[in-house]
């Protein structure tokens, strides 16, 4: 009887045993290797014959386990659409990609293909922290208290108010979301707007 | 008793167009692969098509390929094989034949075969 | 495509006669090759498969071998009804090819 142990095999079910690495080929009716990463099929399997694989040629790819007769060709990461490169092309992995800082991605089909301008974050906000940069727009947070912002900008960070005290000095205005503390020389006599007022 | 009859033969001129039929019976035609083969007056056996057993895939040798086209309705238990721009050559006793369904891929049951002539 | 080459091409006989058929394929088909039998007007009927296994119905005078490249049909006593043309037919490789075929007469 036939050897059944390495691919070209008999199907009778149309399913091969090992799925990442084999396929059915219907009209052999077999089950035959399909080409490792970084090459493609030279020449097709047949009952008498496995699948031939070949490198992929330079500036082309097959990322995974495949039966293609060509492999895919390299494409650079576009700067007019906002991206750009973290790792070139190889035979085995495309070009990677990712937005340019400042930018996050505003079109996805399987990957990334068009990176859009931040969204500003107002005075006494700042943008939530994500888990992956540049895969979605800001989401503008409020300080949280004892924090202020004072830009309107993409990636400002709110900061903690200044302490008077730490710098030998006292509070003139408290701090807001949007302002940072006042301080002064204790010496000095109070600003206008609060003569009158007694401090304790 | 497993049968295929084919029908359709006949005279066309070259250029001309002709459909072949081969109704099956006795065995579940839905199961198996089915075959054209051709035999020229007075020479040996050709593979002219291929179909699977549910008429997704079809394959021809490049001397009809883009000219025939195999296909199957498995409700009517039937096979057809539409031939254009037919040529002198393609003159023959057409038979229709049915593809073992196990490991080893043989021809296990043969039509009577159909006459195309192709001739002005 | 694999070249299949049948001989002899003709070949007279008589009842009795032991008889050895062969065809040689241009590269090796793993035993996929299958031997047919026909009469004129008649189509052609399973023998042999997988170079060695008799077909159901067929006679036990009928034996096929070989392996590689290199197989044979033989008949060990000819019957009168065993005078047709015989032809090797590989299907381990589309297209699938047959043999010239083996015209086997009554000497």
């Known amino acids: 009887s036939q050897p059944q142990a390495v691919p070209p095999y008999a199907s009778e079910n149309q399913t091969c045993r090992d799925q990442e690495k084999e396929y059915y080929e219907p009209q052999h009716r077999i089950c035959c290797s399909r080409c490792p990463p970084g090459t493609y099929v030279s020449a097709k399997c047949s009952r008498i014959r496995d699948t031939v694989c070949a490198t992929c040629a330079e500036n082309s790819y097959n990322e995974h386990w495949n039966y293609l007769t060509i492999c895919q060709l390299c494409r650079p990461c576009d700067p007019v659409m906002g991206l750009e490169e973290i790792a070139p092309c190889t035979s085995k992995r495309k070009t990677q990609c990712r937005c340019q800082p400042g930018m996050f991605c505003a079109a996805w089909a399987l990957e990334c293909t068009h990176c859009e301008l931040l969204s500003d974050c107002p005075p006494g906000t700042e943008a939530e922290l994500k888990d992956e940069v540049g895969k979605g727009n800001n989401h503008c947070v409020p300080c949280k208290a004892g924090h202020f912002q004072n830009t309107s900008s993409p990636s400002a960070r709110c900061q903690p108010h200044t302490r008077c005290e730490n710098q030998g000095l006292v509070e003139a205005a408290p701090g807001t979301a949007q302002s940072d503390t006042t301080c002064k020389n204790p010496l000095e006599p109070l600003p206008p707007e609060m003569s009158g007022t007694m401090l304790m | 008793e497993v049968q295929l009859v084919e029908s359709g033969g006949g005279l066309v001129k070259p250029g001309g167009s002709l459909r072949l039929s081969c109704a099956a019976s006795g065995f579940t035609f839905s199961d198996y692969y089915m075959y054209w083969f051709r035999q020229a007056p007075g020479k040996g056996l050709e593979w002219v098509a291929t179909i699977s057993d549910g008429g997704s895939y079809t394959y021809y040798p490049d001397s009809v390929k883009g000219r025939f086209t195999i296909s199957r309705d498995n409700a009517k238990n039937s096979l057809y094989l539409q031939m254009s721009s037919l040529r002198a050559e393609d003159t023959a006793v057409y038979y229709c034949a049915r593809e073992e369904n196990g490991n080893f891929y043989y021809f296990d049951y043969w039509g009577q075969g159909t006459t195309v002539t192709v001739s002005s | 495509d694999i070249q299949m080459t049948q001989s002899p091409s003709s070949l007279s006989a008589s009842v009795g006669d032991r008889v050895t058929i062969t065809c040689k394929a241009g590269q090796d088909i793993k035993s996929y090759l299958s031997w047919y039998q026909q009469k004129p007007g008649k189509a052609p009927k399973l023998l042999i498969y997988y170079a060695t296994r008799l077909a159901d119905g067929v006679p036990s005078r009928f034996s096929g071998s070989g392996s590689g490249t290199d197989y044979t049909l033989t008949i060990s006593s000819l019957q009168p009804e065993d005078f047709a043309t015989y032809y090797c037919?590989?299907?381990?490789?589309?297209?699938?090819?047959f043999g010239g075929g083996t015209k086997l007469e009554i000497k």
């Open positions: 037919l590989q299907h381990g490789e589309s297209p699938w090819t």
